[in-house]
């Protein structure tokens, strides 16, 4: 059941990021954490692509990193939220 | 303020495994980056990899890459690391370690793990 | 993954003299979120780390104000203004920006 709701959150969190278009800095952030970007040295905002994690979310940066988890923690808020209300809306049918 | 209390010293033979063992009080555990990092004798500190508990998330260095494992029991406050395949350069102090703003503020007090034939 | 050279790897300096470490990474430790992920430890014989530095030059509360970091990008440096007994330890300088995480090689300093 764990795989499964981390699976659902891990597309969520992709989904997510791609329409937040006013959220700019989340979506270059999951741009990079998924797809990489090209050259790019430590100071610039690019970086290589190559690490995997366990989840298969690329980034070469720590904060990168926990900025990610942040993210996904918030979106699983969320979505916890909408699912509960989901469950006490169906009671009350 | 955390606090991180590891397992007991190990012998372990070459080519075994090893698991230890790091619990966590005084914080949020399933929102800590746990990290693992070993000094060897008389040498100096190397990282091995973290876990984030919330989602399991784990990231290694690529020097252990398929011969670590670290994993988190919630509901223990429980992180741990184990680490296959052992050979007597792996004989160190492993420290379990707790990141805040970016660097490992809260460190276990180490756990010797011996590799002897 | 990133180098970081340390220097010198031992010191010994009389008390109540300046002892400076030098810290020097293969790579920019200046992260995209402004922050400057260099951070400085001290080890006591038979004692876990201790964190000392963090953010190039953020004194960890309850650490004496004789220590002090500085520096930029590649180069860094750990300085103990005023050298006391107690501060005999190996100190090392660690990159928390880039993934593989590591650290010097560490600097030993005694009392001359």
């Known amino acids: 059941r764990r795989d499964v709701a981390h699976g659902i959150l891990n597309e969520a969190y992709r989904k997510v990021l791609d329409q937040l278009s006013a959220g700019k800095h989340l979506q270059s952030l999951v741009a990079r954490g998924v797809g990489g970007s090209l050259g790019g040295g430590a100071g610039d905002d690019a970086e290589p692509l190559s690490k995997r994690h366990s989840d298969g979310i690329f980034t070469d940066s720590y904060s990168r990193y926990r900025k990610q988890m942040a993210v996904k923690k918030y979106l699983a808020a969320v979505l916890g939220k909408r699912y509960k209300q989901r469950v006490k809306n169906k009671g009350r049918r | 303020e955390v606090q991180l209390v590891q397992s007991g010293a190990e012998v372990k033979k070459p080519g075994s495994s090893v698991k230890v063992s790091c619990k966590a009080s005084?914080?949020?555990?399933?929102?800590?980056?746990m990290h693992w990092v070993r000094q060897a004798p008389g040498q100096g500190l190397e990282w091995m990899g973290l876990i984030y508990p919330i989602f399991a998330d784990t990231r290694y260095a690529q020097k252990f890459q398929g011969r670590v494992t670290i994993t988190a029991d919630e509901s223990t406050s429980t992180a741990y690391m184990e680490l296959s395949s052992l050979r007597s350069e792996d004989t160190a102090v492993y420290y379990c370690?707790?990141?805040?703003?970016?660097?490992?503020?809260?460190w276990g007090q180490g756990t010797l793990v011996t590799v002897s034939s | 993954d990133i180098v970081m050279t340390q220097s010198p790897d031992s010191l010994a300096v009389s008390l109540g003299e300046r002892a400076t470490i030098n810290c020097k990474s293969s790579q920019s430790l200046l992260d995209s979120d402004g922050k400057t992920y260099l951070n400085w430890l001290q080890q006591k014989p038979g004692q876990p780390p201790k964190r000392l530095i963090y953010?190039?030059?953020t004194r960890e509360s309850g650490v004496p104000d004789r220590f002090s970091g500085s520096g930029s990008g590649t180069d860094f440096t750990l300085t103990i203004s005023s050298l006391q007994a107690e501060d005999v330890a190996v100190y090392y300088c660690w990159q928390g920006t880039w993934f593989d995480l590591t650290f010097g090689g560490g600097t030993k300093v005694e009392i001359k």
């Open positions: 005084g914080g949020t555990f399933s929102d800590l980056y």
């Open positions: 370690a707790i990141d805040q703003d970016g660097s490992f503020a809260y």
């Open positions: 953010w190039a030059s």
